[in-house]
Interface confidence: medium
């Protein structure tokens, strides 16, 4: 058969939950402390909550059925009677009463024909303000007749025909009634919720609703024009040219900011947006949803997309509607011919209308922002240059911030990219130019995206002119080649000598992508004599070992994930892992990761790595090979300085350093 409507699916679920109580029994959730009842869907059934309020489950006859004394459940179909009688069956006795008062209407309801009545519940009539009720029943009940006729359609309409966004023609001056049928199974009629649907009558069908509905005469734009509370919104809509859309056909939800909402915004922020056509359009579009959303349709958190493209979380807490968790809706369900308006008393400013400074102020990077401002870079954060700000998280500065000196200023300038980027378009090997004139590289890993040593820690925030990338550490631009880095740091003097003697200087000076696990002088000194001799006595072996310390791609710590097997220039793979923020290579911790170079990255280690081939065969017995002899002689001789041993000068240097 045809696919079931959401309402029918929910009803089916309620029937399923009630079947242990007998045939045609439906489980109903009632919000504690209210008379609000809902047929239950799966999610609500397990959560036992509606709009954050606890519910109790009760079991009632499903629509169209009734109990039989002495029998289980609701085995009997309700007897069919005319529409007037059926109003009583569904409990809409006040509608019956008012029907009687009109004199003309009861004969219609009892006579031939086919009609649909959206009958307000007794509570709905009772909740009408006294002056509204008085106006309905005065004027020889003409108003009452008109009001009731507006609740009627001149044919039978069942819920499976009630489609989302459709309009029905009422029996009052052919005025439209708006129908919305939501994915959660809730059906609304002019934003009144269907409580009991599809009660058949001999001459039609009755649907019980939770409000008295009235005709809709104005479009959204006209309502904005009429209401004093929308003075600022009115001006903004006019300036943006959105009035054409808001008075046209369609079905929208306008989350309409009141004057009070605009007044909550600091003057400069507001005036900047109102004076910028693009930002203004984005601001207003962020208050418009692509379809009509009645308050009654919200029974739990729901993600909705605005015309601007931002996702809002619309939810409810008891009787209050919430947006992004805040109860800012002051007046709900104002119906327009082209949608529905909810008054809100807080402005929803999208990222796309914000300056970099505003984006950053709302993120976990406020410490970095203060540094940028103190360094005199504030204009870049609030201006109209197309920029990307690489802002380290506050946690990066938990041990304090650097003093604002020339070095810090320069470092901060290198955290601002001269283009407005989006991380989804970044690619591996891409270079980005900073305000400080540096070229930064992009590294794309399986689970992270890094710029030099710093990786993106949160989704981009794209503002009016600038984009904010939240970074996991302070970015250090490369200052030279790997060889320059090693030569410039006296911890690596022995490594530098070894690289030179192994003929790898050229490799580590030229363009390339290397990850170098750099053993410190202490690492070399800690080598057992046998290892030391094997390393130093054979240039080929030395080169082999050193190549095992060099990966053939750039791997910064943020790109490691849990475990990466990195191919070395020697051929074997290095096992690089990250646990508790500590990088390890072959299970040995890295002392200092991520020293960036133009052709790679250096990770400082305090041990010399052994290729797999060297590990199993290793024997601890005494060895008297020529290299060891040379090493011993050189050690002794360099102390005594007596005779010349034929050693390459770099080895000589190495030996000298090993003694210290």
């Amino acid at each position: 058969g045809p696919a079931k409507s959401p309402y029918q699916l929910v009803l089916q679920h309620s029937r399923l939950r009630g079947r242990q109580h007998g045939p045609n029994v439906c489980a109903v959730q009632k919000v504690i402390g209210t008379n609000r009842k809902y047929f239950t869907n799966c999610k609500q059934w397990y959560q036992r909550k509606i709009c954050g309020k606890s519910t109790v489950i009760s079991y009632e006859c499903c629509p169209g059925y009734e109990k039989v004394p002495g029998e289980k459940g609701c085995p009997a179909a309700l007897p069919l009677s005319n529409l007037y009688e059926t109003l009583g069956v569904v409990g809409s006795t006040t509608t019956q009463l008012y029907t009687d008062r009109t004199e003309k209407l009861r004969p219609e309801m009892e006579g031939p024909g086919s009609f649909t009545i959206f009958a307000p519940s007794n509570e709905a009539w009772a909740s009408l303000p006294a002056e509204v009720l008085d106006s309905l029943v005065s004027n020889v009940n003409i108003e009452l007749l008109n009001a009731l006729r507006y609740h009627m359609v001149g044919r039978r309409v069942l819920t499976d025909e009630l489609k989302h966004g459709m309009t029905l023609t009422s029996m009052y001056q052919n005025s439209n009634i708006q129908i919305h049928h939501y994915p959660n199974g809730i059906v609304t009629v002019n934003c009144a919720r269907l409580l009991k649907a599809d009660h058949h009558a001999t001459n039609g069908v009755v649907h019980l609703i939770d409000k008295v509905i009235s005709t809709i005469t104005n479009n959204i734009q006209q309502i904005i024009e009429i209401e004093d509370t929308f003075e600022t919104l009115r001006a903004a809509v006019a300036a943006s040219g959105l009035n054409t859309m808001l008075e046209g056909n369609g079905q929208y939800t306008l989350l309409a900011p009141t004057n009070e909402a605009f007044e909550k915004i600091p003057s400069e922020t507001l005036n900047r947006i109102l004076g910028d056509p693009e930002a203004l359009r984005d601001l207003l579009n962020n208050h418009i949803l692509k379809s009509a959303m009645c308050a009654e349709a919200i029974v739990a958190g729901l993600s909705v997309e605005t015309l601007e493209g931002t996702t809002l979380e619309v939810g409810c807490s008891g009787d209050m509607l919430t947006i992004n968790g805040k109860a800012i809706i002051s007046n709900k369900d104002i119906l327009a011919t082209n949608g529905v308006i909810h008054y809100i008393d807080e402005l929803l400013i999208p990222d796309s209308a914000k300056t970099l400074f505003e984006l950053a102020a709302e993120s976990d990077v406020s410490t970095a922002i203060d540094l940028f401002r103190q360094a005199g870079l504030g204009n870049h954060l609030s201006g109209s240059e197309r920029l990307t700000l690489l802002a380290p998280l506050n946690s990066v500065f938990k041990d304090g911030t650097p003093p604002i000196d020339a070095h810090t200023r320069n470092l901060l300038r290198n955290h601002i990219i001269k283009d407005q980027l989006a991380s989804k378009y970044l690619y591996h090997g891409q270079t980005l130019e900073t305000l400080g004139g540096k070229k930064l590289r992009v590294f794309v890993y399986r689970n992270s995206l890094c710029i030099e040593n710093s990786c993106i820690a949160a989704h981009d925030k794209r503002g009016r002119y600038g984009t904010l990338f939240t970074m996991d550490r302070v970015l250090t631009p490369p200052m030279g080649t790997v060889m320059d880095v090693l030569k410039g740091d006296n911890r690596f003097s022995m490594l530098v000598a070894a690289i030179q003697s192994a003929g790898l200087t050229e490799t580590l000076n030229r363009e390339g992508v290397y990850t170098v696990f750099a053993p410190t002088n202490e690492a070399f000194r800690a080598l057992p004599p046998r290892e030391r001799s094997r390393l130093l006595g054979d240039a080929k072996e030395l080169a082999n070992i050193l190549k095992y310390h060099i990966g053939d791609e750039i791997l910064v710590s943020g790109g490691i994930g849990a475990l990466v097997r990195l191919k070395s220039l020697q051929g074997d793979k290095l096992e690089v892992s990250l646990k508790n923020n500590v990088v390890s290579v072959n299970k040995e911790p890295v002392a200092e990761p991520d020293i960036m170079a133009t052709n790679g990255v250096v990770h400082v280690i305090t041990n010399v790595l052994q290729p797999p081939a060297n590990r199993p065969q290793e024997r601890g017995d005494e060895l008297a090979d020529s290299a060891l002899e040379i090493f011993k002689q050189a050690s002794a001789f360099s102390r005594a300085s007596q005779r010349s041993v034929r050693l390459a000068p770099v080895y000589q240097k190495l030996l000298e350093r090993m003694k210290h």
Partner: antibody
């Protein structure tokens, strides 16, 4: 370093006019919001007027609205305050002030002030 | 308009001792969107122009000694001087830059005992 030098103050009769000028140096003038703030003798500070970096947004205190006009000339790195229909209560030291950046905010740098006396 | 009220109006302090002054606004200066307080503090030394001390309610302007600190949120703010020095004398003003018209407090005059 940043320098703001006001000029144009003096003695004027009630109903008269004066034009204050402020010469700015040591920074990119066109990048900053600028303000006039005044201080009546022995009294506190009172914000008078604001002009945005591009001159688009202009705001006045109610007490001077319709009588004073703030303007700027980025080519000359100068800020102006045209004061018409002067009253005795306009007597004050007028400070030319630079904002923190092109984002309207607090008053970061102040000139030394120029004195305006309105008296018959 | 947002009204700024400072207290005390006069604050005599012994050098080396701490000092504290208060500023209250008639409406909240905390912008929920960025959790910033739109409040600044200034010092006007005798015969001089005012100078900026604190912005965002608590961020010290560069070059301002760390004995000055701003605190508070919403409508109640405090400026503290941990150890008053002779050069700190003058009138201290708080100012809101949340909404136009921007307004100042009437000032607290700090003097040496």
């Amino acid at each position: 370093q940043v320098q703001l030098v006001e000029s144009g103050g003096g003695l004027v009769k009630p109903g008269g006019s004066l034009r204050l000028s402020c010469a700015a140096s040591g920074f990119t003038f066109s990048d900053y919001y600028m303000y006039w703030i005044r201080q009546a003798p022995g009294k506190g500070l009172e914000w008078v007027a604001t002009i945005s970096d591009g001159g688009i947004y202009i705001y006045y205190a109610d007490s001077v609205k319709g009588r004073f006009t703030i303007s700027r000339d980025s080519a000359k790195n100068s800020l102006y305050l045209q004061m018409n229909s002067l009253r005795a209560e306009d007597t004050a030291v007028y400070y030319c002030v630079r904002g923190w950046d092109r984002y309207d905010s607090w008053f970061a740098c102040w000139g030394q002030g120029t004195t305006v006396t309105v008296s018959s | 308009d947002i009204v700024m009220t400072q207290s005390p109006l006069s604050l005599p302090v012994t050098p080396g001792e701490p000092a504290s002054m208060s500023c209250r606004s008639s409406q909240s200066l905390l912008y929920s969107s960025n959790q910033k307080n739109y409040l600044a503090w200034y010092l006007q030394k005798p015969g001089q122009s005012p100078q900026l001390l604190i912005y965002w309610g608590s961020t010290r302007e560069s070059g301002v000694p760390d004995r000055f600190s701003g605190s508070g949120s919403g409508t109640d703010f405090t400026l503290k001087i941990s150890r008053v020095e002779a050069e700190d004398v003058g009138v201290y003003y708080c100012q809101q830059y949340y909404r136009y018209p921007y307004t100042f407090g009437q000032g607290t005059k700090l003097e040496i005992k």
